[in-house]
């Protein structure tokens, strides 16, 4: 007996062909004996079986001798033996229909579960294998979980069923609601302009939530809500919004957030959260700001950090093309009675430079410059 | 809901190879045969050919012989060669999906050939 | 192959009538066949299929009868959207053929 596997939705063909080059009589019947659809001559007729509306056959290829059976929005019931009789001889084929599904929906957040259900008719003893965009293999029976999703978990999951040594395959696409980055660093001198960005790893016909960002200033005790602010189709509302610092929100997508100052007593590290409609938990996004000031009191030349910085990080003071003065793994670096020109001060990890401020040492009979 | 997407080169010289790709989109390829039809001005509405899933073929006796109509599963695409094109070939070439009758229809790629 | 001819070619009609298109083969092609209707820079629409059967999506003011070589097409009360081009298919033998279309234009 032929063996035909099946897709739920999909459509199937089940072949049937006489040794004769020519149009001539053929039924198909299912295993009670219904007939399902057959010729008088040139016409198609059908029998009473359920499948009547979805179930056709191709006139053109009668003419070589096949009459298939073609079965539309197949359906798990559809598993069943069919029985093609022409020529005085019987064809059986056996279709098994499967289905495979995402647990609830296919736009999960970072984080949460995935579990793909298989459905098979019953006496089938299939075994699925998927394979998950980022080329991760995982198998099952009837049911797959894969926990903690990540955010190249998006993209098309493919699953192959095997079943009597055939294969059907199935392609899930899974899209992981996440921000792009976990978390990001803006460096900043006092006194610019701070832009904060956060961008969204999927892009979605509607997009509804509310968010929020709450901070942590390295100089508090305690953290703080900003801003907070609504989502509705893709645009932005702000509901809510601090005096100090008096942050500005862009309008469109993606969240894009202005601090007209980078302050000392601003520095520090934000948590953005996005609650989306019809979700269960939230998206985060962790930010952290940097402020470098570098100043002169008196005889004494000061270049300070506030926020979170990593202890690899290098804090110099420098005059103009010379050898650094000053070189330290602190948040603070000085130098006492500084020659006069041009000194910067630069925070730098590895030799990479991350922030730079510069400052004018006027000849001791002067106050200084800051440029 | 099916819907067909279909690409390939507009202007061709004589005596080159028209190539065509269709791409299914919201749905497989299993169960339905797969055709390629042309239109032009002169010869109307003129099937080419089709294929199916498995890669059987049927063409139009009156083009056979420069003729190959190829699928790729793995993409959900299937794609029409033409080889040794002449004036007579400028048409309007369409993709579409049949069982007996054409449902759905790409969009039509114009295919002109000029020396 | 199987010739399909359809008649008139073209034909002039107002909002709300009635109008017939004829298409025969020739040969007997039992009820495998089917209308289309195609408006300039777009593909055909599939509007009748089994010479009588209403294609999903299409509206009641289109039928189609006939079988072996005589068919009709018949749009009970035209709207604007209705002119256009209509093509007949036999899907009886390959090659898969089409008449050369029946072009309904405004009176």
């Known amino acids: 007996k032929k063996v035909v596997l099946g897709k739920k939705g999909d459509t199937v063909e089940l072949t049937c062909t006489a040794s004769q080059k020519k149009s001539i009589q053929f039924h198909w019947k299912n295993s009670n004996q219904i007939k399902i659809l057959g010729n008088q001559g040139s016409f198609l007729t059908k029998g009473p079986s359920k499948l009547n509306d979805r179930a056709d056959s191709r006139r053109s290829l009668w003419d070589q001798g096949n009459f298939p059976l073609i079965i539309k929005n197949l359906k798990i019931e559809d598993s069943d033996t069919y029985i093609c009789e022409v020529e005085d001889q019987k064809e059986e084929v056996q279709l098994l229909v499967f289905g495979l599904t995402a647990n609830s929906d296919t736009h999960l957040l970072q984080g949460q579960s995935l579990t793909l259900t298989l459905e098979s008719p019953p006496g089938s003893s299939p075994s699925v294998q998927c394979r998950s965009p980022r080329g991760k293999n995982i198998q099952g029976g009837k049911t797959l979980s894969v926990s903690q999703l990540e955010l190249q978990d998006s993209g098309t999951w493919t699953c192959t069923v095997l079943q009597n040594q055939k294969k059907v395959e199935f392609k899930i696409d899974i899209v992981v609601l996440a921000f792009q980055k976990a978390s990001s660093i803006v460096y900043k001198k006092e006194g610019e302009q701070v832009e904060f960005s956060f961008p969204l790893a999927f892009t979605v016909e509607k997009l509804t939530g509310s968010g929020e960002l709450w901070w942590q200033a390295e100089r508090a005790s305690s953290s703080k809500s900003w801003i907070t602010f609504d989502l509705k189709n893709k645009e932005v509302s702000v509901k809510r919004v601090t005096q100090d610092p008096k942050l500005q929100m862009g309008k469109k997508l993606p969240l894009h957030l202005t601090l007209p100052q980078a302050l000392p007593q601003y520095a520090g590290s934000g948590n953005l959260t996005l609650a989306l409609e019809a979700k269960t938990g939230k998206l985060h996004q962790e930010v952290n700001l940097v402020v470098m000031r570098a100043t002169q009191l008196q005889k004494n030349l000061t270049c300070e950090v506030w926020g979170p910085t990593s202890p690899k990080l290098m804090l110099s003071l420098k005059l103009e093309n010379k050898e650094a003065k000053v070189s330290k793994r602190e948040k603070a670096v000085w130098v006492l009675n500084p020659e006069a020109g041009m000194w910067q001060c630069l925070l730098s990890d590895s030799g990479q430079v991350l922030l730079e401020s510069n400052i004018k040492v006027l000849p001791t009979w002067s106050t200084p410059v800051q440029p | 809901q099916v819907q067909l997407q279909q690409w390939g080169a507009g202007l061709l010289k004589p005596s080159e190879t028209l190539s065509l790709t269709c791409a299914v989109y919201?749905?497989?390829?299993?169960?339905?045969?797969w055709s390629w039809i042309r239109q032009s001005p002169g010869k109307g509405l003129e099937w080419i050919g089709e294929?199916?899933?498995?890669?059987?073929?049927n063409y139009n006796p009156s083009l056979k012989s420069r003729v190959t109509i190829s699928v790729d599963t793995s993409k959900d695409q299937f794609s029409l060669r033409l080889t040794s094109v002449t004036a007579a070939d400028t048409a309007v070439y369409y993709c579409?999906?049949?069982?007996?009758?054409?449902?759905?229809w790409g969009r039509g790629t114009l295919v002109t050939v000029s020396s | 192959d199987i010739q399909m001819t359809q008649s008139p070619s073209s034909v002039s009609a107002s909002v709300g009538d009635r109008v017939t298109l004829t298409c025969r083969a020739s040969?007997?092609?039992?009820?495998?066949l089917a209308w289309y209707q195609q408006k300039p820079g777009k593909a055909p629409k599939l509007l009748i299929y089994?010479?009588?059967s209403l294609q999903s999506g299409v509206p009641s003011r289109f039928s189609g009868s006939g079988s072996g070589t005589d068919f009709t097409l018949t749009i009970s009360s035209l709207q604007t959207e209705d002119f256009a081009t209509y093509y007949c298919?036999?899907?009886?033998?390959?090659?898969?053929?089409f008449g050369q279309g029946t072009k309904l234009e405004i009176k």
């Open positions: 040969q007997d092609i039992s009820n495998w």
């Open positions: 919201g749905g497989s390829l299993s169960g339905y045969y």
């Open positions: 089994a010479a009588s």
């Open positions: 294929i199916n899933q498995s890669g059987s073929t």
């Open positions: 298919q036999q899907a009886n033998s390959f090659p898969y053929t």
């Open positions: 579409t999906r049949v069982l007996n009758w054409f449902d759905p």
